[in-house]
C-alpha cells in the first residue's frame, strides 16, 4: 500500500474537505521540481520566484544575479541561454508553440560584459532554434529551414544550408514525425564537445503525403494547416547528415555522414547522434522494419576532410522477438577511452540492462541482470556508472537511482535513492554537474514531491532545493483517496494496478468503477508518483473507485509482456483491461453495474475496443482524441508494432482492429467520443470516422469536437472537457449533482 | 602558380639525423596538409606521413614512429621533415608533396625532391 | 596494410596504341561514396605527377586520354592513344587506411 501525505487525527475530520473539480482545474494542489541548470562541476543557475537569473556555487556557498528581472522584462523573455564563455546570455522571448517540442521565438543577445544588449548584425525573427557552442559563445540557429553560424554574437551569420524549404526541405529541425515519433526534440544539430564541429541532420519530405486540416480562427473562411505527414505504408521522408567544420566552414563546407550499407539497401530511419569527442562521433540508423539498428562510429579523417565510417565500427542490434530498443532504440553512454560504450538492451532473458561493448555487441559484457530492467544511464566517470532501474523490493512502477563502481573489480552496485526518504520517495529521476561532481535528486512521489541537492562523490544530501512546503499545508485540510499498488497474476501473466479509493473507503460496501487506460506500446500508468489531479476528485469527492492497469505490451516487466502485442495491436491491452475489471468485480467492493472506462489517444482507442469488446462489463466509456484505424497514424509510430499495411505484411490485422469494424457493438453502451478538429498528431480523421461507422450502424453515441485545438485539448478547452466528462460519469454511474 | 621547392641534397653517416625543407608557395600554406613520401634508388614510392600546417595535426607510418619528425612554420610557409638514427637504407629520394583539396588523400603538387645518400 | 598489386610489371606498347594498366588490392579501398584510389605518371629523375583521383576523377591539365575506373579492390588506368611522353612508370596509390600505400609500379616503354 502506497502511503500518502499522512492525515490528521479523526477528531478533525469534520474539518476536512474533499477535493473539487476546480481545485483540479485550478492546479490548486500542483508542485514544483527544481532542475539546477549545471554550467561548471560546481556551479548552477537557476531562476529565482521574482524571476532573477541567479548563479549558486555550491563549494563556497555564494550566490549571485547575473541578469536581472529588469533585464528580463525589457524584452519579455521567457527564457535565457548563458553562454558557455559566460560572456552573453540569449533571452527568448514571442515564443510561439508548433508541434509537441517545437516552436517558434526571438531572441536577442545580452552582453554580460558591458551590460547592453548586442547591436549590429541581430538575429532574424522568428528563429526555429538556437543554440551557443559547447565552449566559447558560437551561435547556431534555424531561420526558414536553413542553418546559420556566427562566430561571436555581434558577427555577421554564416549560412550553412540554402536548400532549406516550408514543410519540403527542413536543416537542423526534425519534420513532424521525426520530432514526435523519433527524436523527441526540437532540434536536430548537435555540436561537437569542443565546437569544432556541428553535424545536422537534412529532412527532405518533398514525396510525404500531406494531411491538410482546416483551421477555423475568427477569419471569413478558414485557413487550411498543411502537414507533411507519413502514415502507415507511406512515403517517409529522406533522412542524410552533414558536418560541417565551424572554424573553416567555408573550406569544404558541409561533409555528408555515410549510411551503413546494410542501412543504406532498403527504406531507413536516422534514429540518433552522440558526440564521442570533436573528431569522432555517433550515428544510429534504423531500418523502415524497425527491428534492426545500425550504430556506427565515425572518425574525422583530415587527410579526406570528411568521416570514415568503417565497418568494423558498426554495431547492429535486432530483435528476433519484436521491435529494436524499447519506445526507442536507446543511445550509447561513452566511456572515457572514447571508443567502448554503455547501451541499455535485452539480456538473453529478455530484460532491458546495461552491457559494455568495448569491440563487438557479440562480445559485450553485461553490467547488470535480472528481473527488472534498466532504465536509464544517467552519467559514465572515470569511476562509477549512475543509472535508474526498477529493481528494487520489484515494484515495476518506481525507479532509483544506483551507483556502480567501474573503477573498481569487481564492480560493486549501491543503491543511492533507495532509504532516503523510503516512504515519501519511491520514483526518481537524476540531474548531474560536470564530471558528476554534484547532482540533484528529484522525487516524484508517491509522496509530496522533493528535489534534493548531493555531493557526488559521498552521495551527502547537501540541501534541499524544493520541499514543496505550500502544497503540503494546503493538503493538511483535503481528505485525499488511498492508493494501493498491487498485481494480479492471470495465466502466467502479471497485471500491475494502481487502486484509487474514496477516502472513507470501506470493503463491505460497493463502489462504481472507473478504469483509466492509456495501454500504449512501452508506456506504464503504474508508478509510484504522485498526483492530485481529475480521478483524484472523482475518488475524493464522487466516491468513485479508479483503477489503472498495465498489461501486455507495457514497459519495463522484459519482453515477454512488451513484445506481446508485436504485430498484434488492440487486442492484448484489451483484454488484459477486461480481465483486471473482473478480478476487480471478485474482490467485493464494485459495484458491476457501474463500471466505465476512459482513455486519452492510445487510451481513447483501447477504451474504445473495450467498450465494444461485447462483454457486457461496462456500462458506458469516454474516448478521447482516439486513434481509429492504425492506417491513420504516423509510419514510423504504427509500422514499429504492426509492419506495413500491405496484402504480404499485416494488413489484415491492421483492418481487423480498427474501431470502425466493431461499430454494432457500441449499441449496448454509452459512449462519449471527444476530439479536437485541429489535431496535428492524431487526426480529426480518426474520430470522424467512428462517428460515420457508428451513424451507419444506427447506434446512438454522444460527442464533443473542440475547434482549432491539438492533441492536448488545453486551455479553456481542458475546463471544458473534463467539466464535460464528469457529467457524463455521473450520470453514467447515477450520482446526484 | 603552386610551387614546392625543396632543400638541397645531403650526404649523412649512419646514425646521424637530417632535416629536409620544402616550401610552398602560390597558396594558402595552413590550408593544405603537407604529405612526405621518398623513393629509394630504382624502387617505388613509400608514404612517410602528414602533416597539417593550420591545425598542426600530424600523421606518421607505423613503421618510421619515432624516428621521424614533421613541423612547419607558418610564418615562412615551410614544411620540415627531421628523420633521425639514418641507416643506409634511409638513402633515398625524399619528396614533399601538397594533399590536393578534392582528393581525399591524392597529391596534387609535388617538390622536385632531396636526395639523402646515408653512407659510411 | 593495405598490399596494391599492379600489374603488369611492364607494358610494351606503340604510340597510338591502347594501355590498360591494373591494379588490385588486398582489401576494398571505398566507401558507398568515394574511392580511395589514385594514380601518378612519374618520369626518370622527375618527382611523380598526379593524373587521376579518386579512382575516375581526372585531375586538371591532365589529357582526356587518360581514364580510370574501378572500385572496392580493382581498379584500372587507361590511356586510351599512347602519344610518345607517355612512356613512363605509373604508380597506383591508396588513401583509404594509414598508411598510405603504393604500388610496385607499372613500366610502360615503347614496343
Known amino acids: 500500500i502506497v502511503l500518502r501525505p499522512s492525515r490528521v487525527h479523526n477528531s478533525e475530520e469534520n474539518t476536512m474537505r474533499a477535493l473539487t473539480l476546480k481545485d483540479i482545474l485550478n492546479g490548486t494542489f500542483s508542485y514544483k521540481t527544481f532542475f539546477p541548470n549545471w554550467i561548471s562541476g560546481q556551479e548552477y543557475l537557476h531562476q529565482s520566484a521574482d524571476n532573477n537569473i541567479v548563479l549558486y556555487n555550491i563549494e563556497t556557498g555564494q550566490s549571485y544575479t547575473i541578469l536581472s528581472n529588469r533585464t528580463m522584462k525589457s524584452v519579455n523573455a521567457s527564457n535565457y541561454g548563458l553562454s558557455p564563455d559566460r560572456q552573453f546570455v540569449y533571452l527568448e522571448s514571442d515564443y510561439s508553440k508548433l508541434w509537441r517540442y517545437s516552436y517558434t521565438a526571438t531572441y536577442y543577445i545580452y552582453d554580460l560584459s558591458n551590460g547592453e544588449f548586442v547591436r549590429g548584425n541581430e538575429l532574424p525573427r522568428p528563429i526555429q532554434y538556437l543554440c551557443w557552442s559547447p565552449v566559447g559563445s558560437k551561435l547556431a540557429y534555424v531561420y526558414q529551414n536553413n542553418i546559420y553560424l556566427k562566430q561571436r554574437p555581434g558577427d555577421p551569420p554564416f549560412q550553412i544550408t540554402f536548400n532549406g524549404r516550408e514543410n519540403k526541405i527542413f536543416n537542423g529541425i526534425p519534420d513532424w514525425v521525426y520530432e514526435e515519433e523519433m527524436l523527441a526534440t526540437k532540434y536536430a544539430l548537435w555540436w561537437s564537445p569542443n565546437g569544432k564541429f556541428l553535424a545536422y541532420a537534412e529532412f527532405n519530405d518533398t514525396d510525404i503525403p500531406v494531411i491538410a486540416y482546416s483551421y477555423y480562427g475568427d477569419e471569413q473562411y478558414p485557413r487550411t494547416i498543411n502537414i507533411p505527414y507519413p502514415k502507415a505504408g507511406a512515403k517517409n521522408p529522406v533522412v542524410r547528415i552533414f558536418i560541417i567544420d565551424t572554424t573553416y566552414p567555408a573550406y569544404v563546407g558541409p561533409q555528408e555522414v555515410p549510411v551503413p550499407a546494410m542501412i543504406a539497401s532498403s527504406d531507413y530511419y536516422f534514429s540518433w547522434l552522440t558526440w564521442v569527442t570533436d573528431e569522432r562521433v555517433c550515428l544510429q540508423w534504423l531500418k523502415r522494419v524497425q527491428n534492426v539498428s545500425v550504430l556506427s562510429i565515425c572518425d574525422f579523417r583530415e587527410d579526406w576532410q570528411t568521416w570514415d565510417c568503417p565497418k568494423t565500427q558498426e554495431h547492429i542490434e535486432e530483435s528476433r522477438t519484436g521491435w529494436a530498443g524499447g519506445f526507442f532504440v536507446s543511445t550509447p553512454v561513452f566511456s572515457y577511452d572514447a571508443i567502448s560504450y554503455y547501451k541499455i538492451f535485452s539480456d538473453k532473458d529478455g530484460y532491458k540492462h546495461i552491457h559494455y561493448i568495448k569491440d563487438t555487441v557479440e562480445n559485450a559484457i553485461q553490467i547488470t541482470s535480472g528481473k527488472w530492467e534498466a532504465i536509464n544511464i544517467f552519467r559514465v566517470t572515470q569511476d562509477s556508472l549512475f543509472y535508474s532501474s526498477n529493481e528494487f523490493e520489484e515494484y515495476p512502477g518506481r525507479r532509483n537511482i544506483y551507483r556502480i563502481s567501474i573503477g573498481s573489480y569487481p564492480p560493486s552496485k549501491k543503491c543511492v535513492t533507495c532509504h532516503l526518504r523510503k516512504e515519501r520517495c519511491q520514483y526518481y529521476t537524476a540531474s548531474f554537474s560536470d564530471y558528476a561532481k554534484y547532482y540533484a535528486l528529484v522525487c516524484y512521489g508517491p509522496g509530496i514531491p522533493i528535489s534534493t541537492l548531493h555531493d557526488g562523490r559521498t552521495d551527502q544530501e547537501i540541501k534541499i532545493l524544493e520541499e514543496n512546503k505550500e502544497l503540503e499545508n494546503a493538503l493538511k485540510n483535503i481528505q485525499l483517496p488511498k492508493e494501493e499498488i498491487k498485481k494480479l497474476e492471470v495465466d502466467e501473466i502479471t497485471l500491475w494496478y494502481k487502486m484509487i479509493l474514496p477516502p472513507q473507503f470501506d470493503r463491505s460496501k460497493k463502489y462504481p468503477l472507473l478504469i483509466q487506460v492509456y495501454g500504449g506500446p512501452c508506456s506504464q500508468s503504474v508508478r509510484s508518483v504522485f498526483a492530485v489531479n481529475w480521478i483524484s476528485y472523482l475518488a475524493s469527492k464522487e466516491g468513485m473507485v479508479i483503477a489503472l492497469v498495465d498489461g501486455r505490451g507495457t514497459a519495463f516487466q522484459g519482453d515477454k509482456l512488451l513484445y506481446a502485442v508485436y504485430r498484434k495491436l488492440g487486442v492484448y491491452e484489451v483484454e488484459d483491461q477486461i480481465t483486471a475489471v473482473r478480478k476487480f468485480i471478485e474482490m467485493g467492493f464494485i459495484d458491476e453495474k457501474r463500471i466505465a472506462i476512459w482513455g486519452w489517444s492510445y487510451g481513447g482507442y483501447v477504451s474504445s475496443l473495450a467498450l465494444a469488446s461485447g462483454t457486457g462489463l461496462f456500462k458506458c466509456g469516454i474516448a478521447v482524441a482516439p486513434v481509429s484505424s492504425w492506417e491513420y497514424y504516423a509510419s514510423v509510430y504504427t509500422e514499429r508494432f504492426m509492419g506495413l499495411p500491405t496484402k504480404d505484411d499485416n494488413l489484415e490485422h491492421y483492418k481487423n482492429s480498427t474501431v470502425m469494424a466493431r461499430a454494432e457493438y457500441f449499441r449496448n453502451v454509452d459512449y462519449l467520443l471527444i476530439h479536437g478538429t485541429a489535431d496535428d498528431n492524431v487526426h480529426f480523421q480518426n474520430s470522424a470516422q467512428i462517428a460515420k461507422a457508428l451513424v451507419n450502424a444506427q447506434v446512438d453515441f454522444q460527442a464533443m469536437w473542440y475547434s482549432d485545438q491539438n492533441h492536448g485539448l488545453s486551455g479553456l478547452s481542458t475546463n471544458h472537457l473534463y467539466t464535460h466528462m464528469t457529467h457524463f460519469l455521473k450520470q453514467c454511474f447515477s450520482l446526484s449533482d | 602558380q603552386v610551387q614546392l621547392v625543396q632543400s638541397g641534397a645531403e650526404v649523412k653517416k649512419p646514425g646521424a639525423s637530417v632535416k629536409v625543407s620544402c616550401k610552398a608557395s602560390?597558396?594558402?600554406?595552413?590550408?593544405?596538409?603537407i604529405h612526405w613520401v621518398r623513393q629509394a634508388p630504382g624502387q617505388g614510392l613509400e608514404w612517410m606521413g602528414w602533416?597539417?600546417?593550420?591545425?598542426?595535426?600530424?600523421k606518421y607510418a607505423q613503421k618510421l614512429q619515432g624516428r621521424v619528425t614533421m613541423t612547419t612554420d607558418t610564418s615562412t610557409s615551410t614544411a620540415y621533415m627531421e628523420l633521425r638514427s639514418l641507416r643506409s637504407d634511409d638513402t633515398a629520394v625524399y619528396y614533399c608533396?601538397?594533399?590536393?583539396?578534392?582528393?581525399?588523400?591524392?597529391?596534387?603538387?609535388w617538390g622536385q625532391g632531396t636526395l639523402v645518400t646515408v653512407s659510411s | 596494410e593495405i598490399v596494391l598489386t599492379q600489374s603488369p610489371g611492364t607494358l610494351s606498347l606503340s604510340p597510338g596504341e591502347r594501355a590498360t594498366l591494373s591494379c588490385r588490392a588486398s582489401?576494398?579501398?571505398?566507401?558507398?561514396?568515394?574511392?580511395?584510389m589514385h594514380w601518378y605518371q612519374q618520369k626518370p629523375g622527375q618527382a611523380p605527377r598526379l593524373l587521376i583521383y579518386?579512382?575516375?576523377n581526372l585531375e586538371s591539365g591532365i589529357p582526356d586520354r587518360f581514364s580510370g575506373s574501378g572500385s572496392g579492390t580493382d581498379f584500372t588506368l587507361t590511356i586510351s592513344r599512347l602519344e610518345p611522353e607517355d612512356f613512363a612508370v605509373y604508380y597506383c596509390?591508396?588513401?583509404?587506411?594509414?598508411?598510405?600505400?603504393f604500388g610496385q609500379g607499372t613500366k610502360l616503354e615503347i614496343k
Open positions: 582489401q576494398s579501398v571505398s566507401t558507398s561514396a568515394y574511392s580511395y
Open positions: 608533396a601538397r594533399h590536393g583539396g578534392t582528393g581525399r588523400g591524392a597529391m596534387d603538387y
Open positions: 579518386g579512382a575516375s
Open positions: 602560390g597558396y594558402t600554406f595552413t590550408a593544405n596538409i
Open positions: 596509390q591508396q588513401s583509404r587506411e594509414y598508411p598510405y600505400t
Open positions: 602533416i597539417h600546417p593550420g591545425s598542426g595535426s600530424i
